[in-house]
Amino acid sequence: SAGAGSHCQKTSLRVNFEDIGWDSWIIAPKEYEAYECKGGCFFPLADDVTPTKHAIVQTLVHLKFPTKVGKACCVPTKLSPISVLYKDDMGVPTLKYHYEGMSVAECGCR
Amino acid sequence: SAGAGSHCQKTSLRVNFEDIGWDSWIIAPKEYEAYECKGGCFFPLADDVTPTKHAIVQTLVHLKFPTKVGKACCVPTKLSPISVLYKDDMGVPTLKYHYEGMSVAECGCR
């Protein structure tokens, strides 16, 4: 798995809805692949982490003043939806076909 | 200034172009306010950090398995442009009114 020493990348993160207390309203799936963005944003920032100009600037300032300014952070830059079957207020199962922003599609340095 | 103990917020970061070696092509300004996103993304994530569903999920998983999964990260979610006077390839001073993505407008948890 991608630790702090490795560069920013998408890693597996299986989320069980029971673990986060969402099983009270999400019937299915029981778990899903959320992914996680892990690793460092090191100089020089590679194209694959799609850095913004601000992230590039912050990385350069961090190089000069490492105690004063933090590195850019490895975060989701594009998310994907999943479909979920949930219980409404009356306990009736209903489908949300395009439940936005639940899974990481891409990671980057921001 | 916002430390690791405070919640995610926008803080001042004055960037001097000489410090980062960009004074070789940026004529003016000599420095500008880039801002920095600092602070933690703690449970529960407040509305003002505009969390994505994935950030909410990751925060809940981090609560349950703090050593396995990291917290969401405080990053720029909206950037602003600045105007710069720079030297083009032939050394001619050129004004760029909207040099995009140079300054933080908003921070959030991602």
């Epitope: 692949e33 999943i82 479909s83 207020d89 209903t94 489908l95 | -």
Partner: antibody, heavy 114, light 110 residues
Framework: EVQLVESGGGLVQPGGSLRLSCAAS????????MSWVRQAPGKGLEWVGR??????????DYAAPVKGRFTISRDNAKNSLYLQMNSLRAEDTAVYYC?????WGQGTLVTVSS | QSVLTQPPSASGTPGQRVTISCSVT????????VHWYQQLPGTAPKLLFF??YRPSGVSDRFSGSKSGTSASLAISGLRSEDEADYYC???????????FGGGTKLTVLG
Amino acid sequence: EVQLVESGGGLVQPGGSLRLSCAASGFTFSNAWMSWVRQAPGKGLEWVGRIKSKTDSGTTDYAAPVKGRFTISRDNAKNSLYLQMNSLRAEDTAVYYCTTGTYWGQGTLVTVSS
Amino acid sequence: QSVLTQPPSASGTPGQRVTISCSVTNSDIDIFNVHWYQQLPGTAPKLLFFHDYRPSGVSDRFSGSKSGTSASLAISGLRSEDEADYYCAGLDVAMRGPVFGGGTKLTVLG
């Protein structure tokens, strides 16, 4: 008991308009994401579009063949879903179902013919 | 041409086990979100399976599975009342909604 009842189907000329309704009961309609799905005679199922709940921003999405011609709306006070169909074509002829994805109405037939 | 490919027909005799496949031919479709509907002659579709969830009233003779880029629906102990059209459905991320397979007409022989 969950019930979805469509109405408003019928015969319409090409280029014409029609408004379908779906009356919902037995569940919290205002929180549900509602879709229209159609089925041409002897053919398979085709998603038409969907409207999200107000808490999920109430946005609508449409399948490419109907985008710009069909409009989905809802009236949570009346537990009703609507499909406004304009510039109808022969290929829009189908049984139109309103659905939560888990529950479906019996469908209403729309025939586009001159 | 649907991006979810199903065989147009399948058949079996009473008591037999029949499997209907559904394969993904487009990267915008996530196999994770594939689920199944049954449409008896002259009636509206009915949800049979969503992930590992079988709605109440659906026989446990129906089971779903996924592997790689395909999903399948298995019907054991085939009965005459199982004669119907079966549709797989998935989430089309680009279209922001569900997409259906072409359907499989199941005939119970004898």
